[in-house]
Interface confidence: low
């Protein structure tokens, strides 16, 4: 007939498991209930997905581990007396007096409940990883935590090998006795330590729970040490980098915390499981009761089959381990589940030509003196697009990609980005908003949806922001239609007339030409160089200026670069930024300054691209540790991550413009990283590419 | 025990707005899914809407455009308001309780409050 | 909406008597989950509608054991194996595996 097998990690569980089942035998309860002895949570995880056991309740860093590596489902969650519903929330709670955000934690004083408790320890460090604010090399959690805060109390972190940082705020009892240890031995140790470290001034930030703060003060608390504490006194730090108050934990917490679930094979009826122990909770989990589903006493224990805390158990609606978890445990989950075993020995970066194979040489050398992990390895490849290939073949790891790489990379080879450039913020050239610039005329005035018609001016043909956004985005938005493919011909026949100064003029509609001048003696009309005086982004507004034409397609800086004094060619001496205005893509027009509510496009940053199987946060983790010793173009290490110039080339590996490598935070896909108006505009101008 | 109360005037002018109050006790209206449900004259039932312990709103597209569910933790009380009313709003309204611990299904009911449209 | 249809519209039945009431859903009541989210009700004279069977067949708390549910898919029965006087009402179906709930026309238990 058909059974359940219930896997028990532990001598005291299948002892408690047995009674179970026992007690539901006798209780008439179907299907029978039967007990498999595993060695622990992983263990019991493969012997349910190797199906010789079926059932078994995991924490939520389990129920993440078995739903992504090995396919299985939660299907009945606990439901808890004190907490929220199915879940609790992790918080960081600071005292009101100190200036500390979620922002400014590095360098903070840290308590936690002990190592590798949820709330205390996982949450937030696998939120400060995933978030980007932490960087861990090699998965080297405790190093890289040890270096992040200003020393912590983190009980149980004695055994490890940053001791010395992960238990200097730790104070034992008052004999001094069991420092560090991970049990009330340790007056830090748990919820109430934890935010005792705080409260008497050891640490700058505590990682409790939502009810920790409220239930330790305003005269709640027993013990002395926060007999005068008052819950007014501290604040939450929100993941947004602002704070609030503790009473706020719902809107302004770490992550909201799974409760336990019991975990199945994705083809186990989750119904017929919910019944089983459904019946089994009507009848077993009442005081007096012949045995007891939710106490573990009887068995010298805590927490055996079920949490103890349990008041009932509930059917899961959405059986994925990523419904029940939430995304906030989620993304901190991926922060911190490294596996120093797994962690392939090399990253082997794609490299395009003989210079950049010096550079990463180089770079693979500097490394290894410094002992960064993991170790690189240079692989070689013909183009961009076959770093693609190589990367989704497994035969390289990683490659630094424009824009329109990235896209191709995503889409078609379905990587993902691992870390990005960021640029100076007054370097706009190399991350920048396309614009569409018109002359402020209360008159003719005109919106982005009335363009046909109107004649335009382009930086050139297949500029970025000169011709391929704005030409996508009008494709994409319905209003340049072509016919079999034919872009050119389309765009001559939207607009009235243009200049897109070309290099290759055959089989070039002349519209888009007519308003092209060439140089001073009306030669080389409509060439793709500066002797076309309308070529580039100066250019097309210099179109726009001379009243050639009603929009120049533009990049946002262009108005600034080219008024107000700032080029004192005689064309532009004279003008002022607020005789222009932005076409928005809303309908509306605005300032010039408006830019960035105002734009057809944002062209992103380079970003690194990999597998989506390749860890993330170890990637950034190595490129962050490498750039405190090689970032800095003036840096006396003996390699320079973001210059070139020792190779007689420019943007090897990295673009020479970059300040930093940064995370990517939220934006973890293709399309996330470009930005949807870019992705927009790629595709409405590779929806012609027959 | 679980009690649900629906007050509110029981008559309504046409084009007026309806406003009841479902006042819970024996339980936090900060758990589970609290629930609007009418009965026309013949019998015929219609689930209108819930609000959720979270304070999320789900309404029976077919209201949509009229209906509101708010509510006050502090008073474990919930409201319904419906804009617009014809004589075919015209029923009986009970407020009800849904948990996961039915799978769903409304577990307690109001004794619910007669509503007449009409000038 | 999903239509729920109930038969008969009126049960006149003796005491102690059994009764079988059924419902009929336009579609399959059979969640993507595997559950089938079935429920009935029922509304005395007077009184607010009180559950008395959810998803199919499970018993609401307090419900005597001579009612019971079956059914899957589309058909379901609520039967009542001896019909008592506290019994009569109006029994109502409803489902809520689709969005909105909605609930059946009523069958009327009286006395012959």
């Known amino acids: 007939g058909m059974e359940v097998r219930w896997c028990a990690t532990s001598d005291p569980e299948q002892h408690k498991c047995g009674n179970m089942s026992e007690a539901f035998r006798e209780a008439g309860i179907q299907p029978s209930l039967l007990c498999v002895r595993g060695t622990s949570a992983d263990h019991c995880v493969q012997l349910i997905a190797a199906q010789e056991a079926d059932a078994i309740t995991l924490d939520g860093g389990a129920i993440y581990e078995a739903g992504k590596e090995h396919g299985l489902k939660p299907v009945v969650g606990e439901v808890y007396d004190q907490e929220v519903g199915t879940s609790y929330y992790a918080v960081a709670v600071v005292r009101r007096s100190s200036h500390v955000t979620i922002d400014t934690l590095k360098g903070v004083k840290s308590c936690h409940t002990g190592i590798n408790r949820t709330v205390g320890w996982n949450v937030p460090v696998g939120y400060l990883v995933e978030s980007g604010r932490l960087s861990v090399m090699g998965c080297d959690v405790l190093k890289a935590v040890s270096d992040y805060f200003g020393g912590s109390c983190v009980p149980g972190a004695g055994e490890t090998s940053y001791s010395e940082s992960l238990c200097r705020l730790c104070r034992g009892d008052s004999s001094g006795e069991g420092v560090c240890d991970k049990s009330p031995l340790e007056r830090y140790y748990d919820y109430s330590g934890a935010f005792r470290c705080l409260a008497e001034g050891a640490g700058d930030v505590a990682f409790v729970k939502h009810s920790t703060v409220l239930e330790n003060t305003d005269g709640k608390t027993l013990p002395s040490w926060g007999q005068a504490l008052l819950s007014q006194d501290f604040e939450l730090l929100c993941r947004d980098g602002s704070r609030a108050d503790v009473t706020e934990w719902r809107q302004c917490h770490l992550a909201r915390v799974p409760a336990h679930a019991v975990v199945v094979r994705a083809d186990t009826d989750g119904g017929l499981i919910f019944r089983l122990l459904n019946e089994g909770q009507r009848l077993f989990s009442h005081e007096g009761s012949s045995f007891q589903m939710f106490s573990s006493e009887a068995y010298g224990q805590k927490d055996l089959l079920f949490k103890d805390s349990t008041s009932e158990l509930v059917p899961i609606a959405t059986q994925t381990y990523e419904a029940w978890l939430g995304h906030e445990y989620l993304h901190a989950m991926k922060g911190l589940l490294c596996d120093p075993n797994r962690l392939p020995p090399y990253l082997r970066w794609c490299v395009l030509s003989t210079p950049e194979i010096q550079k990463c040489g180089d770079m693979a050398v500097a490394f290894r003196r410094q002992r960064l992990k993991p170790e690189i390895q240079c692989v070689s490849a013909k183009s961009p697009q076959h770093c693609m290939e190589r990367i989704q073949a497994e035969q390289v790891d990683a490659v630094t990609l424009s824009g329109e790489d990235i896209y191709t990379a995503g889409k078609t080879y379905g990587l993902v980005p691992a870390a990005g450039e960021h640029y100076a913020p007054e370097d706009s050239s190399n991350s920048y908003y396309v614009v569409a610039v018109v002359r402020r005329d209360s008159s003719h005035a005109f919106t982005l949806d009335e363009l046909r018609g109107k004649r335009s001016c382009h930086a050139g043909f297949g500029s970025p922001a000169g011709w391929d956004v704005p030409v996508g985005a009008l494709i994409q938005r319905g209003f340049i239609r072509p016919k079999d493919c034919d872009v050119l011909t389309a765009v001559s026949e939207f607009f009235n007339a243009s200049c897109v100064p070309v290099n290759n003029p055959k089989n070039y509609p002349s519209s888009l030409c007519a308003l092209c001048v060439g140089d001073e003696q009306g030669r080389n009309k409509c060439v793709g160089n500066s002797q076309e005086r309308y070529y580039g982004y100066r250019g097309a507004f210099r179109c726009l200026v001379e009243n050639a034409g009603d929009v120049a397609f533009v990049r946002h800086t262009t108005v600034f670069d080219n008024t107000n004094g700032h080029n004192s060619e005689p064309w532009a001496a004279e003008l002022r930024s607020e005789d222009y205005e932005l076409l928005c893509p809303n309908g509306a027009r605005a300032e010039v300054s408006q830019f960035a509510a105002c734009n057809l496009a944002q062209i992103p940053p380079h970003a690194v691209m990999v597998r989506p199987d390749t860890n993330i946060f170890t990637v950034y983790g190595l490129l962050d540790k490498a750039q405190d010793l090689f970032g800095d173009d003036h840096n006396k290490n003996g390699f320079k991550m973001f210059d070139s110039s020792n190779y007689h080339g420019q943007d090897l590996l990295f673009k020479d413009a970059t300040v930093r490598a940064v995370p990517v935070g939220e934006k973890t896909t293709y399309r996330g990283w470009l930005g949807l108006d870019y992705v927009a505009a790629l595709e409405g101008m590779s929806s012609q590419q027959c | 025990e679980v009690q649900l109360q629906e007050s509110g005037p029981s008559l309504v002018k046409p084009s007026q707005t309806l406003s009841l109050t479902c006042s819970v006790t024996?339980?936090?209206?900060?758990?589970g899914y609290w629930n609007w449900i009418r009965k026309f004259p013949g019998n015929k039932l219609e689930w209108m809407?819930?609000?959720?312990?979270?304070?999320?709103?789900y309404y029976n597209p077919s209201l949509k455009s009229r209906i509101s569910i708010t509510r006050d933790t502090s008073k474990n009380q919930y409201y319904l308001q419906l804009n617009f009313v014809t004589a075919e709003d015209t029923a009986t309204y009970n407020c009800?309780?849904?948990?996961?611990?039915?799978?769903?299904?409304?577990?307690?009911w109001g004794q619910g409050t007669s509503v007449t449209v009409s000038s | 909406d999903f239509v729920m249809t109930q038969t008969p519209l009126s049960l006149p039945v003796s005491l102690g008597d059994q009764a079988s009431i059924s419902c009929r859903a336009s579609?399959?009541?059979?969640?993507?989950?595997?559950?089938?989210?079935l429920h009935w009700y029922l509304q005395k004279p007077g009184q607010s509608p009180k559950l008395l069977i959810y998803?199919?067949?499970n018993r609401f708390s307090g419900v005597p054991d001579r009612f019971s549910g079956s059914g899957s898919g589309t058909d379901f029965t609520l039967k009542i194996s001896r019909v008592e006087a506290e019994d009569l009402g109006v029994y109502f179906c409803?489902?809520?595996?689709?969005?909105?709930?909605?609930f059946g026309g009523g069958t009327k238990l009286e006395i012959k």
């Open positions: 579609q399959s009541l059979v969640h993507s989950n595997g559950n089938t989210y």
């Open positions: 009800a309780r849904r948990t996961l611990a039915t799978y769903y299904a409304m577990d307690y």
């Open positions: 809407g819930y609000i959720s312990d979270s304070g999320i709103t």
């Open positions: 409803s489902q809520s595996t689709h969005v909105p709930p909605t």
């Open positions: 998803r199919v067949s």
């Open positions: 024996g339980d936090s209206i900060t758990s």
